[in-house]
């Protein structure tokens, strides 16, 4: 644990002359900050700066150029990195008094005049004098109220509901505060706060609306923090709903939003009776104009097997909401004529998911598919090519002999997607062709045998093998294969001499 920071001057309290300057130095083993009486708006004449010194300690100086009654209060120096909400502000304190003959009491905000008492608890009526020597009395409608007074805090006691006034006399001049109203309140020990933003994405010129609702609490202070706050851009409203239970609805409206209004919108509710605080936050983004982003979950070339069911999912981010359509080969997809369906589902505020579903893929489903997303500001599309993969099959296997030369050509026509490869095998011993070991693959480099392949279209291929001379009966096998399957057919090639003998016979 770090030892507490130290303050110079090393005093519990100090009286500073009106309009004079004063400075407080804080020394700590880690970075230190100051907490002081005025709010940020009132503290234009309070300067805080870091100072270098050779002691190895961190030094932060608080300087007031012209002390006024409003500077009266508790100044606390603390380690700023160790602050946790439920812990005491851990630091060193000094109380500064700035006596002002014309200002007997430290100026207060209007909410300070409302004193909330809970269940007969003691309360503090916070009239603090600018001079510790000033005598003060507390009065209500019945006269002087006996209560203990501490010039640093005010009157402490158990007070009945009603108005109270503090009275002081400075150099023969009498001062009275405006009435402090003591109010009894039933408050819950927790704050039930809900935030609602119907939209978190906007474009320039639109109106941002955020609401925060506090339930079952009568007196709540709610502060908004948002990007346009410094410019006073937001309009705040409070609606009190009493039926069926108390509900305070605070609305922040930012008209004519710009990109600079993007950021965190936070409402912080604080219960008047105690330091119970609850915060809620939403992140709003404002875009110069509408936008569309398309994120496919698949590539630009996709394959589907024949009869397969396949889904193609595209994520779309868009604002304002997009219209989404699908095209096939640049024509609108007519779903009712095909076993293809599309749908669009809203996943989040600006996220959509569109699916193209192929129910039972057919060859004719191959083609170019395009998703088009458009709104009033943007159009985006994504196109992919779909190939329906079909197992290879042999359409035709025929031979063609070359008359007297004794040469013969075998043609094998096959189809499939991807285009099948064609392989040739021969069996030279016709009696043993039932045995698989009798078949050999026909190599390309065998003399007097020529093999060639021609593709007829995207899915049909023709392979040819030409035998310069067939001297004995052989069997030829055409094997067509692709990724999805293989098929083979066989054909007998009879030597021309044998054929003529057969013809004579």
């Amino acid at each position: 644990q770090l030892s507490l920071p130290s303050i110079l001057p090393n005093e519990n309290e100090k009286v500073v002359q009106l309009n004079s300057s004063f400075s407080l130095r804080c020394f700590g083993e880690s970075e230190v900050s100051w907490q002081y009486p005025m709010s940020e708006e009132e503290s234009s004449d309070v300067e805080i700066r870091n100072e270098e010194n050779n002691s190895g300690l961190f030094v932060t100086v608080l300087e007031v150029s012209s002390a006024s009654a409003a500077h009266t209060g508790l100044y606390t120096c603390y380690y700023n990195h160790t602050q946790t909400e439920e812990n005491e502000l851990e630091g060193r304190h000094i109380y500064i008094y700035v006596p002002d003959p014309d200002v007997a009491f430290v100026p207060l905000g209007m909410t300070d005049y409302l004193v909330i008492v809970e269940d007969d608890d003691s309360a503090i009526i916070p009239c603090r004098t600018t001079d510790p020597e000033t005598p003060v009395t507390l009065h209500n409608s019945e006269g002087v109220v006996p209560a203990s007074y501490d010039s640093r805090q005010g009157f402490n006691g158990t007070f009945t509901v009603g108005p109270y006034i503090c009275e002081a006399t400075v150099k023969g001049k009498k001062f009275q505060t405006i009435p402090f109203n003591v109010y009894a309140l039933k408050a819950t020990s927790e704050l039930d706060l809900e935030m609602e933003a119907l939209k978190t994405v906007y474009k320039s010129g639109e109106t941002i609306v955020v609401t925060c609702a506090v339930f079952n609490n009568e007196v709540v202070d709610l502060q908004w923090t948002y990007p346009g706050e410094v410019k006073g851009k937001g309009i705040t409203m409070l609606e009190e709903i009493k039926v069926p239970s108390i509900k305070l609805v605070y609305t922040l409206t930012v008209p004519e939003a710009t990109v600079k209004d993007s950021g965190d919108y936070e409402c912080a509710a604080r219960q008047a009776t105690r330091e119970v605080k609850e915060m809620k936050k939403v992140t709003i983004s404002v875009h110069e104009k509408g936008f569309i982003e398309i994120k496919p979950t698949f590539s630009q070339l996709e394959a589907v097997n024949l009869h397969e069911v396949k889904h193609f999912v595209v994520e779309v981010r868009a604002y304002p909401p997009p219209r989404i359509s699908w095209l096939k080969n640049n024509l609108t997809l007519i779903e009712n004529l095909t076993e293809i369906t599309t749908d669009v589902e809203k996943i989040q505020e600006i996220r959509y998911r569109s699916k193209l579903k192929l129910i039972r893929a057919k060859e004719e489903d191959s083609g170019h598919y395009t998703i088009v997303a458009q709104n009033e500001d943007a159009v985006k599309s994504y196109t992919f090519e779909l190939l329906t993969q079909v197992p290879s099959s042999i359409l035709d296997l025929v031979d063609d002999h070359h008359g007297s030369t004794g040469g013969q050509t075998v043609r094998c026509t096959a189809e499939g997607t991807p285009l099948p490869d064609i392989e040739w095998m021969i069996c030279k011993d016709i009696k043993k062709c039932n045995n698989e070991t009798s078949w050999t693959i026909l190599a390309n480099n065998v003399s007097n045998i020529i093999t060639e392949i021609h593709s007829r279209d995207r899915s049909t291929v023709e392979g040819r093998v030409t035998f310069a001379k067939v001297e004995e009966t052989i069997a030829v096998r055409c094997l067509a294969k692709n990724l999805l399957g293989a098929e083979n057919r066989e054909l007998k090639l009879v030597a021309p001499t044998l054929r003529s003998e057969l013809t004579v016979a």
């Epitope: 439920e86 812990n87 005491e88 936050k281």
Partner: antibody
Framework: QVQLVESGGGVVQPGRSLRLSCAAS????????MHWVRQAPGKGLEWVAV????????YYVDSVKGRFTISRDNSKNTLYLQMNSLRAEDTAVYYC?????????????WGQGTLVTVSS | EIVMTQSPATLSVSPGERATLSCRAS??????LAWYQQKPGQAPRLLIY???TRVTDIPTRFSGSGSGTEFTLSISSLQSEDFAVYYC?????????FGQGTKVEIK
């Protein structure tokens, strides 16, 4: 060094009450918020309640609201958890936890835990 | 309340390998996130706070990153003593909530 020692756990019947205590030492107890966190057998951690350094604020997880009360006695450096109308689902090891003693916001010191078993 | 979701539920890693644990918050918790390690029969121990600040005495092989809703705890080279259950916890909102835990076990 910082020490948190829980006591008061045991076996109790459903609907009955139990009071857990946590004795703190090694730091300025009156300056720090204190929490109770529990862990059912074989399960994860669940935050139960917090009390501000000065006792003025108390928060609870919804499942124990109205049944459990967290309190502290800064003069005795002791944290308490009064558990009424106990249910079987309250069976857990209860840890007393210090917050922000050396770091910001996180639970930096834990006791060894005390087992509460609610069973008929 | 903010729901914290950790993944995976169990991570099997060999000693010396890197382990990466994820924690997701149902809404932004800024950098108000802590990581704890718990071994059987022991109380949890704070490792990381402020999403990425390592507690004094915690080995440098432990590191945290992320802000908003997505967070990661990385253990660069697992030692035998690192096999345990790890929890993330947010302290941005009441009630404080923990993730369900990730068990890091020996592969």
């Amino acid at each position: 060094q910082v020490q948190l020692v829980e006591s008061g756990g045991g076996v109790v019947q459903p609907g009955r009450s139990l009071r857990l205590s946590c004795a703190a030492s090694g730091f300025t107890f009156s300056r720090y918020g204190m929490h109770w966190v529990r862990q059912a057998p074989g399960k994860g951690l669940e935050w139960v309640a917090v009390i501000w350094y000065d006792g003025r604020n108390k928060y609870y997880v919804d499942s124990v609201k109205g049944r459990f009360t967290i309190s502290r006695d800064n003069s005795k450096n002791t944290l308490y958890l009064q558990m009424n109308s106990l249910r079987a689902e309250d069976t857990a090891v209860y840890y007393c936890v210090g917050v922000g003693i050396t770091v910001t916001g996180a639970f930096d010191y834990w006791g060894q835990g005390t087992l509460v078993t609610v069973s008929s | 309340e903010i729901v914290m979701t950790q993944s995976p539920a169990t991570l099997s890693v060999s000693p010396g390998e890197r382990a990466t644990l994820s924690c997701r918050a149902s809404q932004s918790v800024r950098s108000n996130l802590a990581w704890y390690q718990q071994k059987p029969g022991q109380a949890p121990r704070l490792l990381i706070y402020g999403a990425s600040t390592r507690v004094t005495d915690i080995p440098t092989r432990f590191s945290g990153s992320g802000s908003g809703t997505e967070f990661t705890l990385s253990i660069s080279s697992l030692q035998s003593e690192d096999f345990a259950v790890y929890y993330c916890q947010q302290y941005n909102n009441w009630p404080r909530t923990f993730g369900q835990g990730t068990k890091v076990e020996i592969k």
